[in-house]
Interface confidence: medium
Amino acid sequence: RKIPKVGHTFFQKPESCPPVPGGSMKLDIGIINENQRVSMSRNIESRSTSPWNYTVTWDPNRYPSEVVQAQCRNLGCINAQGKEDISMNSVPIQQETLVVRRKHQGCSVSFQLEKVLVTVGCTCVTPVIHHVQ
Amino acid sequence: RKIPKVGHTFFQKPESCPPVPGGSMKLDIGIINENQRVSMSRNIESRSTSPWNYTVTWDPNRYPSEVVQAQCRNLGCINAQGKEDISMNSVPIQQETLVVRRKHQGCSVSFQLEKVLVTVGCTCVTPVIHHVQ
């Protein structure tokens, strides 16, 4: 789903307050609800009628350092006989997510939010049928 | 996907540097790649064989303030005749994502990362079949 543009008031102080110095904000250490875990069916990626593979991207200066991307295995969907049915389409499900980018020069370390598009999995859809008028 | 716990070295300065004062870090204003947009097939949620609905949660002290959650409409999947086939299962696809929580007392504003579990959509899977040895 879409993340709104940040060119608004969220990261700004109230108008009656002095502005943030140096274009940076205070980010408290620690993550709220950091122990939560995704709970998904086992082998969902291979049991799906629109199966997918996973690729892990790794970047030590990104938090989280591991970002997993899904790629649909087929153009069509897998039918009850285990064959690809090209009358249906496997399509990716995408999500916008935030990561934190670390930037450092010597002992000066700063962080910046970054928007990343993640393909989370795939779903099987009926193709769009166009009626010519 | 899982987001790692933050009790490691990512948010710490190198050991040879003085520690971060007051348990906070410098977060630069602005978001890298904020103009990236999700590119998904139109009406994927209703065209899917495992269709879903969306619910929007709203929190003005969270960035993004809107978080969209999907809920599978059916236990089974929709077949070519448009009927629910309970020999297959609609299952949710989840993703861990980061949001930013805003905390303010008067003119003192700070921010903290928060992990949120988002159900992004649903996929149709074959149920687990058990072969007893």
Epitope: N35, R42, N43 | K2
Partner: antibody, heavy 121, light 107 residues
Framework: EVQLLESGGGLVQPGGSLRLSCAAS????????MSWVRQVPGKGLEWVSA????????FYADSVKGRFTISRDNSKNTLYLQMDSLRAEDTAVYYC??????????????WGQGTTVTVSS | DIQMTQSPSSLSASVGDRVTITCRAS??????LAWYQQKPGKAPKLLIY???SLESGVPSRFSGSGSGTDFTLTISSLQPEDFATYYC?????????FGGGTKVEIK
């Protein structure tokens, strides 16, 4: 066939260190979360630590946080647990366990045979 | 942390009996629950995952049910090889936690 083989256990004095290893075979090691679980003889199971497939995500039980470090070498298909500042209450059989799914949380579908750690003066 | 409370801590039963073990989580854990069997001197063995899915090779006399916070492991007809200790485990959030165990003994 999936196999997990722990080693490195033994007798150590309080305050000492020990490094456990778990050699894995029979599956794509780098794709799975791996955990350490321990069991005091005659008692129940206690999860100790977990590490993601690429090693970037690590999790610890409060009882070992700051003293134990989990790591993995995917080129050697080996999982490690570095145990420092050991205490008598760390005495247990330590099992290496494989998570049953590549993504998300999971249960443990394969376990090693265990290696015994005894902390005593 | 999520606490897992298992009951009973032990039970005596005969071959052919129907045995039920319960596990209660201190908060909702969705379907992130597993059951294990452990025999003396051996590593635990996964029986059930995702509340009710039977692990490959596990006999169908084992079944799991429940949702939210209350879960049950049922052995429909106890066999001689089923005398062991059984543990539930949640994997909804870290730290992963186990129940205290239920020892199934021969009556």
């Amino acid at each position: 066939e999936v196999q997990l083989l722990e080693s490195g256990g033994g007798l150590v004095q309080p305050g000492g260190s020990l490094r456990l290893s778990c050699a894995a075979s029979g599956f794509t090691f780098s794709s799975y979360v791996m955990s350490w679980v321990r069991q005091v003889p005659g008692k129940g199971l206690e999860w100790v630590s977990a590490i993601s497939g690429r090693g970037g995500n690590t999790f610890y039980a409060d009882s070992v946080k700051g003293r134990f470090t989990i790591s993995r070498d995917n080129s050697k298909n080996t999982l490690y647990l570095q145990m420092d500042s050991l205490r008598a209450e760390d005495t247990a059989v330590y099992y290496c366990a494989k998570d049953d799914r590549r993504i998300a949380a999971g249960s443990f579908d394969y376990w090693g045979q265990g290696t015994t750690v005894t902390v005593s003066s | 942390d999520i606490q897992m409370t298992q009951s009973p801590s032990s039970l005596s039963a005969s071959v052919g009996d129907r045995v039920t073990i319960t596990c209660r989580a201190s908060q909702g854990i969705s379907s992130a629950l597993a059951w294990y069997q452990q025999k003396p001197g051996k590593a635990p063995k996964l029986l059930i995952y995702d509340v009710s899915s039977l692990e490959s090779g596990v006999p169908s006399r084992f079944s799991g049910s429940g949702s939210g916070t209350d879960f049950t492991l049922t052995i429909s007809s106890l066999q001689p090889e089923d005398f062991a200790t059984y543990y539930c485990q949640q994997f909804n959030s870290y730290p992963l936690t186990f129940g205290g165990g239920t020892k199934v003994e021969i009556k």
